[in-house]
């Protein structure tokens, strides 16, 4: 489903020609300096070239644009706005290009942009209007269908004095522009929590990847509106238990498959409902691999093999009997 470059016959523009032609208007459909182009595949690759800005002379035919492994730093408003517009650009990959700031309207004037990958950029400043383009309460719908934001968390010392989760969610929800989003990947972002309103406003999601974060609980997250959700990746988080409300919501989604491997499940009395549910459900993929992490006596026990007698909680002693 993802556009790929099956391009053969790439033409490279010779870097030494760049200065010779820069004074003249760009030729239609020429290949930018430091890039490789295939008109047959409608693909432009400007990969690992230490570019500091988006080339201005991108060919109008481009459908798949790879700008990975560069040093772009900032993506300004209208970074891809051209005259005439890049009307066919459908897939844009900016991963690993040292972006730390994406400004409002950075992706405006790309009417066919379906897939955007900003992964592996330390986004200290992601504008709330990066994807919606305007600060209106309801923006024009974004054409985006797939948004890949894996490992965009900046180093701790570079983060603004605000919640990183909040910054990302603000960009996802601004102007309700991303209502058509079907794939959202937010893996490896050190998320501690998922703001409760985010999923309710992304009703078209089919695939949600939250793996390799630090999510401790899903108690306040509602999956109820995600009728079309098919895969929910929650591997490698810090989940201790899933409570009844979450279990019921997941069970109610007709197509959902949930991935829960490598979470530190706490196998005490609070786990009883989840174990019962796991034994009955077909929702969880690889459920036979889920094991307890705590308490120590339960470590590495398989959740599916537990019974209610195994799941006890130490009685809480009244204060007068507690020792320091």
């Amino acid at each position: 489903s993802s556009p790929t470059s099956s391009a053969s016959s790439f033409s490279s523009s010779a870097p030494f020609l760049a200065s010779a032609v820069s004074a003249q208007p760009p030729l239609p459909d020429q290949c930018p300096a430091l890039c490789e182009c295939s008109e047959a595949a409608r693909t432009v690759k400007c990969v690992n070239r230490n570019l500091t800005e988006v080339p201005t002379d991108l060919p109008a035919y481009v459908r798949n644009l790879f700008l990975t492994g560069n040093q772009l730093a900032v993506l300004p408003a209208g970074a891809f706005a051209r005259r005439p517009p890049l009307a066919e650009l459908a897939a844009l990959n900016l991963s690993g290009s040292r972006l730390d700031e994406v400004r409002a309207g950075a992706f405006e004037h790309l009417p066919s942009l379906r897939q955007l990958d900003l992964s592996h950029n330390p986004l200290a400043d992601l504008s709330p209007f990066a994807f919606s383009g305007s600060n209106a309460s309801v923006s024009a719908p974004s054409p985006l269908v797939e948004l890949i934001l894996n490992h965009i968390v900046p180093p701790e010392d570079e983060r603004q004095n605000r919640s990183f989760e909040g910054m990302v969610v603000a960009a996802l929800l601004a102007g309700r522009a991303l209502q058509g989003l079907r794939r959202l990947e937010l893996a490896s972002n050190h998320f501690l929590y998922l703001p409760r309103d985010v999923l309710a406003q992304l009703p078209s999601l089919r695939h949600l990847d939250l793996s390799n974060n630090s999510l401790v609980s899903l108690t306040y997250v509602s999956f109820r509106n995600l009728t079309h959700l098919e895969s929910l990746h929650l591997e490698d988080n810090a989940l201790k238990v899933l409570h009844n409300g979450t279990l019921a919501e997941l069970q109610g989604l007709p197509h959902i498959r949930v991935f829960l491997d490598n979470n530190p499940w706490v196998c005490d009395c609070h786990m009883a409902d989840m174990v019962t549910w796991l034994k009955e459900t077909e929702v969880v993929q690889g459920k036979d691999r889920l094991t307890c992490a705590y308490p120590e006596k339960m470590r590495n026990r398989v959740l599916l093999e537990l019974n209610s007698a195994d799941l006890d909680c130490d009685p809480i002693l009244p204060p007068s009997l507690q020792t320091s």
């Epitope: 489903s1 066919s112 794939r183 089919r206 695939h207 079309h228 098919e230 007709p254 959902i256 498959r257």
Partner: antibody, heavy 118, light 113 residues
Framework: EVQLLESGGSLVLPGGSLRLSCAAS????????MSWVRQACGKGLEWVSI???????YYASWAKGRFTISRDNSKNTLYMQMNSLRAEDTALYFC????????????WGQGTLVTVSS | EIVLTQSPSSLSASVGDRVTITCQSS????????LSWYQQKPGKAPKLLIY???TLASGVPSRFSGSGSGTDFTLTISSLQPEDFATYYC?????????????FGQGTKLEIK
């Protein structure tokens, strides 16, 4: 190579039953929605049924109750059980894979011919 | 019952011509965009040309384009090539509380003039 190969089509009497198979190679069937589409000779395409990733099934109104779509993930194979067959079910039956993001048929088999006649 | 109506049912054209085929749905397709176009040649399986109303499938020449939203859609071939003579089908995807439904148009046969 990613491909779909249908089999099981044959000549069958009206009122009879038949099971079509569609073997997938090059990808995991369980990761995709899969569908059956048919085409009578010289006629247009007609959607029959679809099965979602976790097994939910949907049918064209005329196929409900007579046709059953299923799959065996361990065999990477899609099936269509067809009962109470009628002359008007005579057609070439294609299996098709649905995109993981868009609701479109992005991979087709070559079809298997079902003929219902006495 | 959802009906997709293509027009014309058949048309004759010459190499180099610009050709437009329309597809009208009796109900809005899912998300207003879930409309695909396929090309089929005799004895062959259909081939995906356009999905999501206007997105070109991989490997499809750019002389093909799609447009439209909701219930009304168009397939355009900007300059006919000899290999384009075939039958074209639109296909819509629909979702309601009772689940998913798919439908095809009756087809448009494109012949050499």
């Amino acid at each position: 190579e990613v491909q779909l190969l249908e089999s099981g089509g044959s000549l069958v009497l009206p009122g009879g039953s038949l099971r079509l198979s569609c073997a997938a190679s090059g990808f995991s069937l369980s990761s995709y929605w899969m569908s059956w589409v048919r085409q009578a000779c010289g006629k247009g395409l007609e959607w029959v049924s679809i099965i979602a990733g976790r097994g939910s099934t949907y049918y064209a109104s005329w196929a409900k109750g007579r046709f059953t779509i299923s799959r065996d993930n361990s065999k990477n194979t899609l099936y269509m059980q067809m009962n109470s067959l009628r002359a008007e079910d005579t057609a070439l039956y294609f299996c098709a894979r649905v995109s993981s993001i868009y609701y479109t048929f992005n991979l087709w088999g070559q079809g298997t011919l079902v003929t219902v006649s006495s | 019952e959802i009906v997709l109506t293509q027009s014309p049912s058949s048309l004759s054209a010459s190499v180099g011509d610009r050709v437009t085929i329309t597809c009208q749905s009796s109900q809005s397709v899912y998300s207003n965009n879930e409309l695909s176009w396929y090309q089929q040649k005799p004895g062959k399986a259909p081939k995906l040309l356009i999905y999501y109303a206007s997105t070109l499938a991989s490997g499809v020449p750019s002389r093909f384009s799609g447009s439209g939203s909701g219930t009304d859609f168009t397939l355009t071939i900007s300059s006919l090539q000899p290999e384009d003579f075939a039958t074209y089908y639109c296909q819509g995807s629909y979702y309601s509380g009772s689940g998913w439904y798919y439908a095809f148009g009756q087809g448009t046969k494109l012949e050499i003039k």
